[in-house]
């Protein structure tokens, strides 16, 4: 079942999932100047069975200037550099991820996707928090949140994390080094 709300916001922290449970939606959103094509689902879906899960539907963006075409616009050098970095980071994280039954890995980027990925999680999903660069983690417990079903309502548990001060960012499970991106996470992996 879909979780009604987004995971809790922690000041000066971002979150991500290491793997996504079946039923998770990822909206097909595009960067400014582009829009998703009219055929195909408006989202990607983590689907499958207990032995193998994968993302169903592929997101595609088309130039909003050229109406009703699926012409792809070649990214500018800065965009290419940004995309390359994101792809590299995604690959690094994929290597770190353990294959969990009934879960999907981070989907690879699609051309001209929005800088922010919007996921809709399902009950049982865990997300992990880390402080953004320049802030230090004070843990009172696990820096994670789980979407749970209680009395027919979904709720996220409160992560026991405070971000304060000036030091290296903390790490997500399975990551040797903090990520190179400015906020400690590649943009494509953050959620609102």
């Amino acid at each position: 079942e879909l979780c009604d709300d987004d995971p809790p916001k922690i000041t000066h922290a971002t979150f991500k999932a290491v793997a996504y449970k079946e039923g998770t939606m990822l909206n097909c959103e595009c960067k400014r100047g582009f829009r998703r094509i009219k055929s195909g689902s408006p989202y990607m879906l983590c689907t499958g069975n207990s032995s193998h899960s994968s993302w169903d539907n592929q997101c595609q963006c088309t130039s909003s200037a050229a109406r009703n075409t699926t012409k792809q616009v070649t990214p500018q050098p800065e965009e290419q550099k940004e995309r390359k970095t994101t792809e590299m980071q995604s690959q690094m994280q994929l290597a770190d991820q353990v294959s969990l039954p009934g879960h999907c890995r981070e989907p690879p980027p699609w051309e001209n996707e929005a800088t922010e990925r919007i996921y809709h999680f399902v009950v049982g999903q865990t997300v992990y928090y880390q402080c953004v660069q320049g802030y230090r983690a004070l843990h009172r417990g696990p820096a994670e949140s789980v979407c749970k079903m209680t009395h027919g309502k979904t709720r996220w548990t409160q992560p026991q994390l405070i971000c304060t001060g000036e030091t290296e960012p903390s790490q997500f499970p399975g990551e040797e080094e903090p990520q190179a991106s400015p906020d400690g996470l590649p943009e494509s992996e953050t959620s609102r």
């Epitope: 959103e29 829009r35 055929s39 169903d56």
Partner: antibody
């Protein structure tokens, strides 16, 4: 909690226009496509079109091109649908609906009558 | 446009029974189908997305299935609160289209 608030009813004269509002709360308005649906007894549900407030992009069902115009005001998190050259055929309940995950407003009952 | 056909306009059932509402698309829509429940005087409530995944708060008595062109919403152990009209919707290709609806009546 996601909410899409619409006026309950509108009564307008034939040949005029009407602008129906849909005020969104409980989510980031600019990040989601918002659609409009027409419901008439005996005609079922019809998708009119949708708008992406973050970029102002719109899609229209060919059937409603020239009839409906979709806009959005990001400062007030409100979407609008203007219907022009109204006739009795436009009398219906109009719903605004977030596309994914789906969430619908309560609907506005439009009556076109002289 | 993709035409969605719900051949049964009305279905009659009893409390505790199991009932299946069906929906047929004029062309392959994958699993890009949603099911809605609409009670008199209310707006449609989303029950199912991607043919078989439930929205939160939807009892597990309601199950969606199917892919391609044929889809089914099954309600097991029917309760009086299930009295409503059920619509399916395809969102595989624009414009998104709906079935004509199936009214569930409780005997």
């Amino acid at each position: 909690q996601i909410q899409l608030q619409q006026p309950g009813a509108e009564l307008v004269r034939p040949g005029t226009s009407v602008k129906i509002s849909c005020k969104a709360s409980g989510y980031t308005f600019t990040n989601y496509w918002l659609g409009w649906v027409k419901q008439r007894p005996g005609h079922g549900l019809e998708w009119i079109g949708d708008i992406y407030p973050g970029g102002g992009y719109t899609n229209y069902n060919e059937k409603f091109k020239g009839k409906a115009t979709l806009t959005a005001d990001t400062s007030s998190s409100t979407a609008y649908m203007q219907l022009s050259s109204l006739t009795s055929e436009d009398s219906a309940v109009y719903f605004c609906a977030r596309v994914t995950p789906a969430s619908w407003g309560q609907g506005t009952s439009l009556t076109v009558s002289s | 446009d993709i035409v969605i056909t719900q051949s049964q306009k009305f279905m009659s059932t009893s409390v505790g029974d199991r009932v299946s509402v069906t929906c047929k698309a004029s062309q392959n829509v994958g699993t890009n189908v949603a099911w809605y429940q609409q009670k008199p005087g209310q707006s449609p409530k989303a029950l199912i997305y991607s043919a078989s995944y439930r929205y939160s708060g939807v009892p597990d008595r309601l199950t969606g299935s199917g892919s391609g062109t044929d889809f089914t919403l099954t309600i097991s152990n029917v309760q009086s609160e299930d009295l409503a009209e059920y619509f399916c919707q395809q969102y595989n290709r624009y414009p998104y289209t709906f079935g004509g609806g199936t009214k569930l009546e409780i005997k």
